[in-house]
């Protein structure tokens, strides 16, 4: 018999453990400021209600939509008005407007301190005393910091987190075991968050078509033995899954993702030869494994692309007959043949091909007009190839920190209006592309670098949208998803920028700098570099090198001094004076 109750349906499909985890994530992503204990109470109430509906679907309110049930529950939070201000106004609205309102109030930069692993003994005691609460707290802390985190993937990372503590809390040296493992997991979580934020932005700002095109290219590279119909099916399912998660429909999203994994594993033969190992795993690991699976080998008998897309006399007829299918087929065929290209580049090529057909199919002699279309791809391919070559050479010469600083200078000159914390965060992440991609073989560099840059630049776009200060950023972020990176790359220094007034307070440092972890020390130095550039945007590389060298020496000297605070107070103003003289 058909299920009347949506919440009972999801509770039964997902099981209690996953249901509770997903509800906790959903509430934490919407009400990011609420304490953990408040969320636990809401989750408990929601789960009890769902359990009741699973037992009797005709129960009161069991037939209500999930948005109605979730929204009603969120709106019972007592401190909503004081803690969230405008968010409380959402509760005056009816569904679906109420949920849309909640979504617009998600804060991409809530300003919580970074998640760190404190004393291992304390952590292990907490883990062993109450495992459920410990893991729930982890889910909550990640979800509130990353309001668009891909919820089913967060359940997977929580399982990994549990595994780390299960293993390391038995170890003789808990810290030695925990530190590298939690750090590696933290990195994965941050990358995962940024990737999903990019997917959500693609869907929300550029629509289904943009997301589907991105997915066609990616999946065609991964599964070159699958035919276009198979790729289309996977893309349609994947779009539904991510639309649901990005829209806060986490139960539906996780359920559909599980269905998709089931479909892939039941149809391995027509998708890829690399899936068997993944498909033998339990659900969470299976879905994660499928998402990360290595790409299949290319079929040996691929015909030249030109036959169907240039030389065929019926190109225009085929294009006009079913434009999106024809362009989709082009993107699929091109992508499966070019695993070494970035998805962004493949989409630019498809865009160029589409523009050429639009123009040529309206002429008297289309074949002679579009006959050289593949030649027009050359500069589009060479641009990211050169960019990767030049920047990897720079990275190899300077190392990660030096490369970050070079990018910091580059981007501060391009976008001096952008806030210092944003410039530092984004440039540090852009600089990591070196470590992440430049060490890879030539054939993997471009796809690694450019697709990673797309994700990082999306972070800039998302942060800038919250408080827009630069028309240049707005333009690059909103004009074209696939051309964002080339748009930012093409920017020269901003000649309209009026330098910032000098403020000695910005360059005043204290002894607390000495006790900071290395990464945070770097952030402080890099923030000073940005402020310096905002004050003197015309500073040369040599001048900056001198000033930053002096600054490093000053920090080292004072941190080694007996009276650190005294040293900072005495030497700081001298450093500022010397820097001003050097940049005069």
């Amino acid at each position: 018999e058909a299920q009347q109750s949506e919440i009972a349906h999801r509770y039964n499909d997902l099981g209690e453990e996953h249901f509770k985890g997903l509800v906790l994530v959903a509430f934490s992503q919407y009400l990011q400021q609420c304490p953990f204990e408040d969320h636990v109470k809401l989750v408990k109430e929601m789960t009890e209600f769902a359990k009741g509906c699973a037992a009797d679907q005709s129960g009161a309110d069991c037939g209500k939509s999930l948005h109605t049930l979730f929204g009603d529950k969120l709106c019972t939070v007592a401190s909503l008005r004081e803690k969230y201000g405008e968010l409380a106004d959402c509760c005056e609205k009816q569904e679906p407007e109420r949920n849309e309102c909640f979504l617009t109030h998600k804060d991409d930069n809530p300003g919580f301190p970074p998640l760190v692993t404190p004393d291992p003994e304390v952590m292990c005691t907490a883990f062993q005393e109450n495992e459920q609460q410990f893991l729930g707290k982890y889910l909550y802390e990640v979800a509130r910091r990353h309001p668009y985190f891909y919820a089913p993937e967060l359940l997977y990372y929580t399982q990994q987190y549990k595994g780390v503590f299960t293993e390391c809390c038995q170890a003789a040296d808990k810290a030695a075991c925990l530190t590298p493992k939690t750090e590696a997991l933290r990195e994965k979580v941050l990358v995962s968050s940024a990737r999903e934020r990019f997917k959500c932005a693609s869907l929300q700002k550029f629509g289904d078509r943009a997301f589907k095109a991105w997915s066609v290219a990616r999946l065609s590279q991964k599964f070159p033995k699958a035919d276009f119909a198979e790729v289309s099916k996977l893309v349609t399912d994947l779009t539904k899954v991510h639309k649901e998660c990005c829209h806060g429909d986490l139960l539906e999203c996780a359920d559909d993702r599980a269905d998709m994994a089931k479909y892939i594993c039941e149809n391995q033969d027509s998708i890829s030869t690399k899936l068997k190992e993944c498909c033998d795993k339990p659900l969470l690991e299976k879905s994660q494994c499928l998402a990360e699976v290595e790409r299949d080998e290319l079929p040996g008998d691929l015909t030249p692309l030109a036959a169907d897309f240039v030389e065929d006399k019926e190109v225009c007829k085929n294009y006009q007959e079913a434009k999106d299918v024809f362009l989709g087929t082009f993107l699929y065929e091109y992508s499966r043949r070019h695993p070494e290209y970035s998805v962004s580049l493949l989409l630019r090529l498809a865009k160029e091909y589409e523009a050429t057909l639009e123009k040529c199919c309206a002429t008297a002699d289309p074949p002679s007009c579009y006959g050289k279309v593949f030649d027009e791809f050359k500069p589009l391919v060479e641009e990211p190839q050169n960019l990767v070559k030049v920047n990897c050479e720079l990275f190899e010469k300077l190392g990660e920190y030096g490369f970050q600083n070079a990018l910091l200078v580059r981007y501060t000159k391009k976008l001096p209006q952008v806030s210092t914390p944003t410039l530092v965060e984004v440039s540090r992440k852009l600089g990591k592309v070196g470590t992440k991609c430049c060490t890879k073989p030539e054939t993997e560099r471009m796809s690694c670098a450019e697709d990673y840059l797309a994700v990082v630049l999306n972070r800039l776009c998302v942060l800038h949208e919250k408080t827009p200060v630069s028309d240049r950023v707005t333009k690059c972020c909103s004009e074209s998803l696939v051309n964002r990176r080339p748009c930012f790359s093409a920017l020269a220094g901003d000649e309209t920028y009026v330098p910032k007034e000098f403020n000695a307070e910005t360059f005043t440092f204290h002894a607390d700098l000495c006790t900071l972890p290395d990464a945070e020390k770097q952030v402080k130095k890099q923030s000073a570099l940005v402020e310096l550039l905002k004050h003197k945007p015309k500073a040369t590389e040599e001048q900056l090198k001198t000033v930053m060298g002096d600054f490093g020496a000053f920090v080292d000297k004072c941190c080694a001094a007996e009276n650190k605070e005294g040293c900072f107070a005495e030497e700081g103003p001298k450093l500022v004076a010397a820097a001003q003289a050097a940049l005069a």
């Epitope: 035919d227 276009f228 119909a229 289309s232 099916k233 033969d269 008998d301 007959e321 024809f326």
Partner: nanobody, 118 residues
Framework: EVQLLESGGGLVQPGGSLRLSCTAS????????MGWVRQAPGKGLEWVSW????????YYADSVKGRFTISRDNSKNTLYLQMNSLRAEDTAVYYC???????????WGQGTLVTVSS
């Protein structure tokens, strides 16, 4: 416009053979997955078999595996279904279908009736 024209159906005794053909027009045949769908009297539609655009991979419903063979000739825009060892339960209207996405079809023909009876 898209047209799919089936032929080759008829009355055949159990254990006998038939070869169905489907001629396609109005679309780029070699770009699409094609298949055969059937509807037995009083039943719903079921996928019998499908074949990739390049012919390199085929799928068969469990009920016809080892008895039916799907093939295509892209130069002739034609799809075939060779049916051997026919059984009474294979009696149905067989439709040629164009598939733009796995598991679905957007066009199918008028159908050709296959009756297996002694």
């Amino acid at each position: 416009e898209v047209q799919l024209l089936e032929s080759g159906g008829g009355l055949v005794q159990p254990g006998g053979s038939l070869r169905l053909s489907c001629t396609a027009s109005g679309f780029t045949f070699r770009h699409y997955r094609m298949g055969w769908v059937r509807q037995a009297p009083g039943k719903g539609l079921e996928w019998v078999s499908w074949i990739r655009p390049d012919g390199t991979f085929t799928y068969y419903a469990d009920s016809v595996k080892g008895r039916f063979t799907i093939s295509r000739d892209n130069s002739k825009n034609t799809l075939y279904l060779q049916m051997n060892s026919l059984r009474a339960e294979d009696t149905a209207v067989y439709y040629c279908a164009k598939s733009y996405m796995a598991g679905t079809f957007d066009y199918w023909g008028q159908g050709t009736l296959v009756t297996v009876s002694s």
